[in-house]
């Protein structure tokens, strides 16, 4: 029998200071742009190479950002989100959520990767 | 398998124009924030121009402004660069180059880029 996987979902606030090349991340997602299926969240597409987002080294490609300096972007279209973030000002607080893939062994069976365990 | 494959670069005489069509397997297209680079014998591989996911914001080196466009074709994973008044300077290998999303920390920097395509000659003589 297959395991299954599961999902450990955690959330963080990540303080970060923009660097000369920006906040030094990409980002998809919003009404206009679900990169989830029916999720129109702002998720990381990517991280800059030595940018801020790398050297703080917590925000992780795939994460979904749930608010910058407190600002909700739920229900955002994609550019409202964008400049959202390039105004964000120097110092920018992220709330971010990792989801992080547990592979969880057969069914009855607990793995070592539950996260139950 | 991620695959930009250029198209449509040529001799053409100064004053001409050349049309350029990268065309896009392998990602979700319409997530990406496409661009075209160029580089001359010798030289770095410079920026030309970019355009966002939606190809409702374009930006272009000052070098090309006015006579070059950027556009993208979503439906048919395609994005082009029309060449117009071309001169012997635009001389060089031009490549298509693509990364996943909107960049919050610039969109000029080759490093900006994870896609790259073989490239395609543009040769203008005077």
């Known amino acids: 029998m297959n395991g299954r996987v599961d999902y450990l979902v955690t959330e963080e606030e990540i303080n970060l200071t923009r660097g000369p090349s920006g906040l030094g991340f990409n980002i998809v997602g919003g009404t206009d742009q679900q990169y989830v299926s029916n999720d129109s969240g702002i998720y990381v597409s990517r991280i800059k190479e030595n940018g801020a987002a790398a050297l703080d080294g917590r925000l992780q490609e795939g994460d979904k950002i749930l608010s910058v300096n407190g600002q909700d972007l739920k229900n955002l279209l994609h550019q409202d989100a964008v400049d959202l973030f390039r105004n964000a000002g120097y110092a920018v607080s992220l709330r971010v959520q990792h989801r992080l893939q547990v592979q969880n062994g057969p069914i009855g069976h607990r793995g070592e990767g539950d996260p139950s365990g | 398998d991620v695959q930009l494959v250029e198209s449509g670069g040529g001799l053409v005489q100064a004053g001409d124009s050349l049309r350029l069509s990268c065309a896009a397997s392998?990602?979700?297209?319409?997530?990406?924030?496409m661009a075209w680079f160029r580089q001359a014998p010798g030289k770095e591989r410079d920026f030309v121009a970019t355009?966002?996911?939606?190809?409702?914001?374009?930006n272009y080196a000052d070098s090309v402004k006015g006579r070059f466009t950027i556009s993208r074709d979503n439906a048919k994973n395609t994005v082009t660069l029309q060449m117009n008044s071309l001169q012997p300077e635009d001389t060089a290998v031009y490549y298509c180059?693509?990364?996943?999303?909107?960049?919050?920390?610039?969109?000029?920097?080759?490093?900006?880029?994870?896609?790259w395509g073989q490239g395609t000659q543009v040769t203008v003589s005077s």
């Open positions: 180059a693509g990364v996943p999303g909107t960049s919050l920390s610039g969109e000029t920097d080759p490093r900006d880029y994870d896609y």
């Open positions: 392998g990602i979700t297209f319409r997530w990406y924030t």
């Open positions: 355009i966002n996911w939606s190809g409702s914001d374009t």
